[in-house]
């Protein structure tokens, strides 16, 4: 019986060349979180392990920064970063909880005139 829920920043937009924080929060469960994985489609971006700390995938280490908290900061954004991002919480004894965030990276002028998905 998995009672937990993942809250995310939902659909967000950011400016090309800028940065964005991806945040998820697991609530409504007392389960022990052992690890959080951040993935983009099928690519692993980063892992935060309760005992071992952060590991950033080598192919992303120049553009991904750990935190704040269990979140992930994406830097030097390109239009190719547009897409789905997933936070995967590994917990005991509940198992796995997954949250989804959709990021749209916009050309600077577009972002200035309407961040369609920006969450206040």
């Amino acid at each position: 019986m998995m009672t937990g829920t993942i809250e995310t920043t939902g659909n967000i937009s950011a400016e090309k060349g800028g940065s964005i924080i991806l945040q998820c929060h697991l609530s409504s469960t007392t389960a022990q979180v052992t690890q959080v994985n951040w993935e983009q489609q099928d690519q692993l971006l980063a892992i935060c392990n309760a005992d071992l700390g952060w590991h950033i995938s080598p192919s992303f280490k120049d553009r991904v920064a750990p935190g704040p908290g269990l979140g992930l900061t994406l830097q030097s954004l390109t239009v190719n970063d547009t897409g789905e991002y997933f936070c995967i919480y590994h917990t005991y004894p509940d198992g796995t909880y997954t949250g989804r965030i959709f990021l749209e990276v916009l050309e600077s002028s577009v972002a200035e005139h309407g961040a369609r998905f920006q969450i206040p």
Epitope: M1, T30, Q32, V33, T34, A50, L70, Y92
Partner: antibody, heavy 120, light 108 residues
Framework: EVQLEEFGGGLVQPGGSMKLSCVAS????????MNWVRQSPEKGLEWVAE??????????HYVESVIGRFTISRDDSKSSVYLQMNNLRAEDTGIYYC???????????WGAGTTVTVSS | QIVLTQSPAIMSAFPGEKVTLTCSAS???????LYWYQQKPRSSPKLWIY???NLASGVPARFSGSGSGTSYSLTISSMEAEDAASYFC?????????FGGGTKLEIK
Amino acid sequence: EVQLEEFGGGLVQPGGSMKLSCVASGSTFSNYWMNWVRQSPEKGLEWVAEIRLKFNNYATHYVESVIGRFTISRDDSKSSVYLQMNNLRAEDTGIYYCTMVRRNWYFDVWGAGTTVTVSS
Amino acid sequence: QIVLTQSPAIMSAFPGEKVTLTCSASSSVSSSYLYWYQQKPRSSPKLWIYSTSNLASGVPARFSGSGSGTSYSLTISSMEAEDAASYFCHQWSSYPYTFGGGTKLEIK
């Protein structure tokens, strides 16, 4: 073998304050959730407070009857957990146990306890 | 909060007798979050059974646990003198964590 030792119990007047300490030896303290549980003939075993890991931003939880009066904290560098108790009441009397928990390792160890007596 | 009610409060058993202690929850508890502790006089509680049915390290195989939802039990297949103790059920499924009032098991 992991060992826990509590300190700081004793006799205190109603409305007074007391700080309990618990020191762990024999394991990597920072990997474990820490709890305080108390026991009295009137109330039996009663969970009091929990503090999780740095990984969890040191999240704390309390039983309702002590919220605003008790504060749990930890110092991983000293392998210690603390319980600051203010505005003590007669019903806070009991044996206070410090417990060290790692759910996914089926690990759950208790100290020998320290007695707190609230009486005028 | 989830209230755990244990019965009986006190019981005694002959050596070799089968013993069953029960723990009833006021609302459903996931079986993974239901633990049992053993406590002997002048000692602190020891984890005895975790996740409803798994024996903690060093616990004799004559102990077993079962249950789901709101009804759980601890069984000793053949009572021995060293099993005389108090047994407490515990849930950490929701805050506040709670304990049952305990069953004091005596040997006849």
